[in-house]
Interface confidence: low
């Protein structure tokens, strides 16, 4: 899993089924 912190504060994680259960992509938690 890749993690990154961008300049606008959200922590974004590339994962599957996190932001949407059936898809993989960047899920950002503010």
């Amino acid at each position: 899993r890749r993690r990154r912190r961008d300049t606008h504060f959200p922590i974004c994680i590339f994962c599957c089924g996190c932001c949407h259960r059936s898809k993989c992509g960047m899920c950002c938690k503010t």
């Epitope: 959200p10 996190c18 259960r21 059936s22 960047m26 950002c28 938690k29």
Partner: antibody
Framework: QIQLVQSGPELKKPGETVKISCKAS????????MSWVKQAPGKGLKWMGW????????TYADDFMGRFAFSLETSASTAYLQINNLKNEDTATYFC???????????WGQGTLVTVSA | DIVLTQSPASLAVSLGQRATISCRAS??????????MHWYQLKPGQPPKLLIY???NLESGIPARFSGSGSRTDFTLTINPVEADDVAIYYC????????FGGGTKLEIK
Amino acid sequence: QIQLVQSGPELKKPGETVKISCKASGYTFTTYGMSWVKQAPGKGLKWMGWINTSSGVPTYADDFMGRFAFSLETSASTAYLQINNLKNEDTATYFCARDRYYGEVAYWGQGTLVTVSA
Amino acid sequence: DIVLTQSPASLAVSLGQRATISCRASESVDSFGNSFMHWYQLKPGQPPKLLIYRASNLESGIPARFSGSGSRTDFTLTINPVEADDVAIYYCQQSNEEYTFGGGTKLEIK
């Protein structure tokens, strides 16, 4: 640009079968799932389920298990909705729809009206 | 299944006034810091149009008269000021657990 183009209106009798097509363009077809949404006359929107365009695996909402089938022709970037043993209550406009990652549906077909009448 | 209840079922608003539509979910639609609630406008003979995504984000090309707010189970779509072209049915939709739509709210001009 992203487009979803559906097949034309259908007039069917009870007990018959209908198959609606939805041709996608402007994006990689297998990257996004395809949902189907029903709007019966004078009624609200009802999500019927979706098909994973990468694996071909369909998921059906509870009310649409049994007579309904989602399928794909990946080489033609086309999704299909088939309804078997048509009933009067299947009279509706059916939309194919492509969402974005968080599940918001930003792209819609124009809708296909299916009329079931003896 | 998550059930979405919209209120009111219909409302009539004078041109230039504010319209407020509520959507209540039977359980939270929040996950990973996101609210998986979206709003659509439906006009006769047209497909639905996405207005607001993830509770409060304005879709590209949609006028800033439309705004959304809320979290967990309670969400609001606001149109201010209302214009004649806004006559339509408005639906909320959740995508936290599969998808479901609310029952719709019909907006008319008083």
